[in-house]
Interface confidence: low
Amino acid sequence: SGTTNTVAAYNLTWKSTNFKTILEWEPKPVNQVYTVQISTKSGDWKSKCFYTTDTECDLTDEIVKDVKQTYLARVFSVPWRNSTHGKETLFGTHGEEPPYENSPEFTPYLETNLGQPTIQSFEQVGTKVNVTVEDERTLVRRNNTFLSLRDVFGKDLIYTLYYWKSSSSGKKTAKTNTNEFLIDVDKGENYCFSVQAVIPSRTVNRKSTDSPVECMGQEKGEFRE
């Protein structure tokens, strides 16, 4: 049989951040290679990562076509000796389908992790500070341009700002559904800032990790009386 000694893939896992999406699985191949297929619930299967010895496959190009669709992937285990026969065929020399394992369903819009945000700048004018969050580019395209996280999520995406006096540990918070905060500060005090991306309407993966802390008196800041 053409599928003798092949081991079905297992632990199929989606790893996705800001729509950069990779399917991972086990085990590392010994006498076999892998081919991955992906489809939407109603679509046709499309093959990716032909005859790979990797245990991961970057499926970003497929899922960004419509991030609101639900996708399913499957990983075929192809006997090593059959992998070089036909051009891009999954079937062994006897024509049988190699063993495969299905992934969990994956809906990028609802499940992709929010990447760690970055504070782009902060500017103090008197007792007010304007903090700007970098609008990170995704790999989702429209009209041949890459959309930002804000473009894709619209009002579903908010940012939470944590800020505190450098001399104390008491944190305050502010929220915005844009990429800017305007907060009141005490004159003459230095403050530190950290932001977090949040999608309140989600049930899973609602929050990003906190951004790196930025403090007044560092390069990103600007002060004007």
């Epitope: 960004v64 991030v67 609101k68 989702v140 395209r141 429209r142 009209n143 959309l147 473009d151 894709v152 999520f153 619209g154 009002k155 579903d156 915005t176 559904n177 844009t178 309140p200 309407s201």
Partner: antibody, heavy 125, light 108 residues
Framework: QVQLQESGPGLVKPSQTLSLTCTVS?????????WSWIRQHPGKGLEWIGE???????RYNPSLKSRVTISVDTSKNQFSLKLSSVTAADTAVYYC??????????????????WGKGTTVTVSS | EIVLTQSPGTLSLSPGERATLSCRAS???????LAWYQQKPGQAPRLLIY???SRATGIPDRFSGSGSGTDFTLTISRLEPEDFAVYYC?????????FGGGTKVEIK
Amino acid sequence: QVQLQESGPGLVKPSQTLSLTCTVSGGSISSGQYWSWIRQHPGKGLEWIGEIYYSGSTRYNPSLKSRVTISVDTSKNQFSLKLSSVTAADTAVYYCARDTPYYYDGGYYYYMDVWGKGTTVTVSS
Amino acid sequence: EIVLTQSPGTLSLSPGERATLSCRASQSVSSSYLAWYQQKPGQAPRLLIYGASSRATGIPDRFSGSGSGTDFTLTISRLEPEDFAVYYCQQVGVVPYTFGGGTKVEIK
């Protein structure tokens, strides 16, 4: 075809709480839209009060935030507005509206495509 | 708060004429969030244009929108009798969502 209908008392006494309900018919309130309240003072322009997502997350106009509560009841397909400590300045026509996220080619457009007919609320003793 | 300034306040024109209404924002607005509405006396506003330039369902093609950033325009190519009304622009991207003060298009 989705329709919205505002209901509630047309007369409210000063310092009391104005309470209005918007009933959604012809569609589900849980279908992924935002639901807004807007008001229009007599002979004036339009003022956005706030909005709610079916999950319960809200956004309010900062100028009214301390007095406004918007809530949703998905079982009744309704959302509601409460405005506390009203004065004569809150006399207006109150509209509810659907704020639709239209998803196209990877991103969103937003607009208020369905409106209720409006209900007049007068604040007077 | 993003302030939307509409001009002119009143536009006096005859049926068949072209109407050009302006909406200027105090800061840049993504076209995804810019809409135009028509309101007639005693009625709720009616969506005309969304995304700055896309016509809503059922809106005649004599209505068109254009612009980006801080300057947006609503054009009615040939005014019909039913087009005389008040027109509002609106942004729904930045809280608080705001409307322009309106432009009244009246019969000359």
